[in-house]
Amino acid sequence: SPTPFGPEGQLADELHKPKAIQTEVKPSVRFNLRTSKDPEHEGCYLSLGHSQPLEDCGFNMTAKTFFIIHGWTMSGIFENWLHKLVSALHTREKDANVVVVDWLPLAHQLYTDAVNNTRVVGHSIARMLDWLQEKDDFSLGNVHLIGYSLGAHVAGYAGNFVKGTVGRITGLDPAGPMFEGADIHKRLSPDDADFVDVLHTYTRSFGLSIGIQMPVGHIDIYPNGGDFQPGCGLNDVLGSMAYGTITEVVKCEHERAVHLFVDSLVNQDKPSFAFQCTDSNRFKKGICLSCRKNRCNSIGYNAKKMRNKRNSKMYLKTRAGMPFRVYHYQMKIHVFSYKNMGEIEPTFYVTLYGTNADSQTLPLEIVERIEQNATNTFLVYTEEDLGDLLKIQLTWEGASQSWYNLWKELRSYLSQPHNPGRELNIRRIRVKSGETQRKLTFCAEDPENTSISPGRELWFRKCRDGWRMKNETSPTVELP
């Protein structure tokens, strides 16, 4: 049958030539076993059919084997994240084999060409794995493919082509362009490994989405909604406009997936948890902080395989840098009545006081309009572990819905600064911790005084009945 064109065809041509007349062609895919944490060390290049390097370099057949697969590149040189990931894997899994899949010659192309090369690179990895499987004690179940961007889809192809089933594939912000909505055999999918977990950090519903938006694994985790990552704003990244471009913002958000994974390796004592939710908006409302029926999971390396889950979308908030862990709280505030509110939309602020620390003043993000005589749910998160919550301070401000109302507000404020007529009545706040799954009810410190005007504060303490514990699994219990 005729050989296809392109790199795959050239590879097939080379493989089918008799040994004697095979030309000296440099492989476009190289496998570098990183035998040392030292970046200066050259490592060992593994070669299909040559067992000597495996022995010489101490390849451990019974240990875990990681294959790190980079993505498309605009430079002919490895990006900085690779060193961090290799180093973190060596630190966490001291006996493991860490292999860098170097496909730079095929990745340093026009993006469309690099995409077309992913299949041949996946095939090359699969053939290496098939060969390793012929060795005693080597198990495909111990293989973990970690692919970043385009490399995630390369890992998918490798998992698809290999004889047997790879233990795990982690997709670190799998590439979006040319893969969004593609057939499962042409992108990373849950069928490519026994467990496929994915971190999405640069997805956009408008403009170009560098990372894939659709879920492509058993669990798909969307930190900070999968779009705008803290610490990656123009101001954060550029310092001043003279020193950078939007490219740095893209790199920061896209690459954040790698750093979240590195964080999960090196900060094992500070695991980040994600919570299953149908969409980002519901998560922002604080509705999805449940761990029942495997609805929460650690992210990154510590993620647990969930049976019968496919394309399970999970969400979490993070800090701007390592360690990325935050502490999530669901807050349910029952607004009993509005008084003289007009068109004013309240914005709530809370300060949480705990046995370990106190939070900063935290705004409650309003996803939908605040309902009167109804329970409103919010998500808040803190960067520090507050311990057991003791009390909550609540304040609110009015945000006008129109310029006319803003003018009315200003006039009203100038004539009567504290406008005692505008009040909200809040008697209790129910809080649930995502990390501990504990539920608590906080009652107004003075039950006779539960009305609050803008700028004033209301204090809530644990209600007499104290802790409201539900029989829900605490994610912290699942840790080794």
Partner: antibody
């Protein structure tokens, strides 16, 4: 032991081009990236670009992108840096430096090549 | 690009004393920071890589620390051969950039 030996000093006229060579020995030339860094008199070091000798892929500092070309000859284990449209402010010492596996730090440097641009 | 700022520009220390050199990055560079020593008429010499990793052949009196945006090179007990110019370099993102240098001189 690892050695990087650069070509000799050059004096050029403004508008001309210069090509500096860097011959590597003591390691597998194609396994590590090679970078070019320059230093004008009394100035900080300035990274110009790098090459992956395995297949010739390059990356350049935007500041020099239109004027610099980095190449290599794997059979001679030699990297080259050519800078065109020379101006007086290009007067500097030009160094080649061997990157680590990831291309981040430079443990070995050439002795430097002085390029003087003067009319 | 990431701007690297070193301080002080000049540091006067007596032999046998401790010297502390600082380097600040304009944005988070994690541990992708390397220190070099340069003497007049010579090429730079790598002292510390990836913020704190030592280099074989470099005396143990040289040590590095820091992460994110703030980094320090410490020379525990200065020897006469340590008086030189010291540069920091980031490899977190292209283009790689160097600090303006700190000149370490004899007091």
């Amino acid at each position: 032991q690892v050695q990087l030996v650069q070509s000799g000093a050059e004096v050029k006229k403004p508008g001309a081009s210069v090509k500096v060579s860097c011959k590597a020995s003591g390691y597998t030339f194609t396994d590590y990236t090679m970078h070019w860094v320059r230093q004008a008199p009394g100035q900080r070091l300035e990274w110009m670009g790098g090459i992956n000798p395995y297949y010739g892929g390059t990356t350049y500092n935007e500041k020099f992108k239109d004027r610099v070309t980095i190449t290599r000859d794997t059979s001679a284990s030699t990297a080259y840096m050519e800078l065109s449209s020379l101006r007086s402010e290009d007067t500097a010492v030009y160094y080649c430096a061997k990157g680590d596996y990831y291309g981040g730090s430079y443990n070995y440097w050439g002795q430097g090549t002085t390029v003087t641009v003067s009319s | 690009e990431i701007v690297m700022t070193q301080s002080p520009a000049t540091l006067s220390v007596s032999p046998g004393e401790r010297a502390t050199l600082s380097c600040r990055a304009s944005q988070d560079i994690s541990n992708s920071l390397h220190w070099y020593q340069q003497k007049p008429g010579q090429a730079p010499r790598l002292l510390i890589k990836y913020a704190s990793q030592s280099i074989s052949g470099i005396p143990a009196r040289f040590s590095g620390s820091g992460s994110g945006t703030e980094f320090t090179l410490t020379i525990s007990s200065l020897q006469s051969e340590d008086f030189a110019v010291y540069y920091c370099q980031q490899s977190n993102s292209w283009p790689y950039t160097f600090g303006q240098g700190t000149k370490l001189e004899i007091k």
